[in-house]
């Protein structure tokens, strides 16, 4: 959950307590286990070649 007093993150991003900033939900494809991805509606799966080149 976003820290008190923090401005809400813009559309397409979510608050990361670990990194102490808003992060792009798009990066959840590459880093799905990041804390901020829980706040993203849906983390799209990585293309096959990105996961298993």
């Amino acid at each position: 959950e976003q820290a008190p007093g923090q401005a809400p993150c813009s559309r397409g991003s979510s608050w990361s307590a670990d990194l102490d900033k808003c992060m792009d939900c798009a990066s959840c494809r590459a880093r799905p286990h990041s804390d901020f991805c829980l706040g993203c509606a849906a983390a799209p799966p990585a293309p096959f070649r990105l996961l298993w080149p």
């Epitope: 397409g12 990194l19 939900c25 798009a26 494809r29 590459a30 849906a42 799209p44 990105l50």
Partner: antibody, heavy 119, light 111 residues
Framework: EVKLEESGGGLVQPGGSMKLSCVAS????????MSWVRQSPEKGLEWLAE??????????HYAESVKGKFTISRDDSKSRLYLQMNNLRAENTGIYYC??????????WGQGTTLTVSS | DIVLTQSPASLTVSLGQRATISCRAS??????????MQWYQQRPGQPPKLLIK???NLDSGVPARFSGSGSGTDFTLNIHPVEEEDAATYYC?????????FGGGTKLEIK
């Protein structure tokens, strides 16, 4: 202040080997994917190799042009990135940049180190 | 591999006007939600610097006169109003799959 500093470039003869090094500071090195990117007048910017995190078992990925010739590695305890290059050829000449990204983009760049492969 | 074609190769823009740079990918680099395209600025003698990630998202500290748009195969970097310090070469880069590739660059000159 984020800083990436490459070293190890220079002149090497065709067929020779070279190991590049990069020391990082100012960010959480062990939480960043690290890559090497080469720049040359002939081929422009070329991504060469990437190494991910300990939690990814330090997974590595390579451009086809360097697969089997170059080896990327990292030492999180020293915040260092390496590139071992073997069987070098003239087309490997260029500026080698150490880069770091939280994910699949390049947030941070070093100033680069120049490698010249020539006899 | 995905090929990124930038146009024009060079352009000259008057101070305060708009610069528009295009990048076309040989295949789509977008999902229904996100586009996996970045833009970098490289000034002479310097390394590239990240400007925009995921097609539209400005990196921290990048002036709001820079903006990115596009999806699928066609992407655009706009700079408005152009300032003298924007004289540089601009590159697109996809992260749809490995290998990541860069465009050939667009050199922007200011008059």
């Amino acid at each position: 202040e984020v800083k990436l500093e490459e070293s190890g470039g220079g002149l090497v003869q065709p067929g020779g080997s070279m190991k590049l090094s990069c020391v990082a500071s100012g960010f959480t090195f062990n939480n960043y994917w690290m890559s090497w990117v080469r720049q040359s007048p002939e081929k422009g910017l070329e991504w060469l190799a990437e190494i991910r995190l300990k939690s990814d078992n330090y997974a590595t990925h390579y451009a086809e042009s360097v697969k089997g010739k170059f080896t990327i590695s990292r030492d999180d305890s020293k915040s260092r990135l390496y590139l071992q290059m073997n069987n070098l050829r003239a087309e490997n000449t260029g500026i080698y940049y150490c880069t770091g990204g939280f994910a699949d983009y390049f947030d941070y760049w070093g100033q680069g180190t120049t490698l010249t492969v020539s006899s | 591999d995905i090929v990124l074609t930038q146009s024009p190769a060079s352009l000259t823009v008057s101070l305060g006007q708009r610069a528009t740079i295009s990048c076309r990918a040989s295949q789509s680099v977008s999902t229904s939600s996100y586009s996996y395209m970045q833009w970098y600025q490289q000034r002479p003698g310097q390394p590239p610097k990240l400007l925009i990630k995921y097609a539209t998202n400005l990196d921290s500290g990048v002036p709001a006169r820079f903006s990115g748009s596009g999806s699928g195969t066609d992407f655009t970097l706009n700079i408005h109003p152009v300032e003298e310090e924007d004289a540089a070469t601009y590159y697109c880069q996809h992260s749809w799959e490995i290998p990541y590739t860069f465009g050939g660059g667009t050199k922007l000159e200011i008059k």
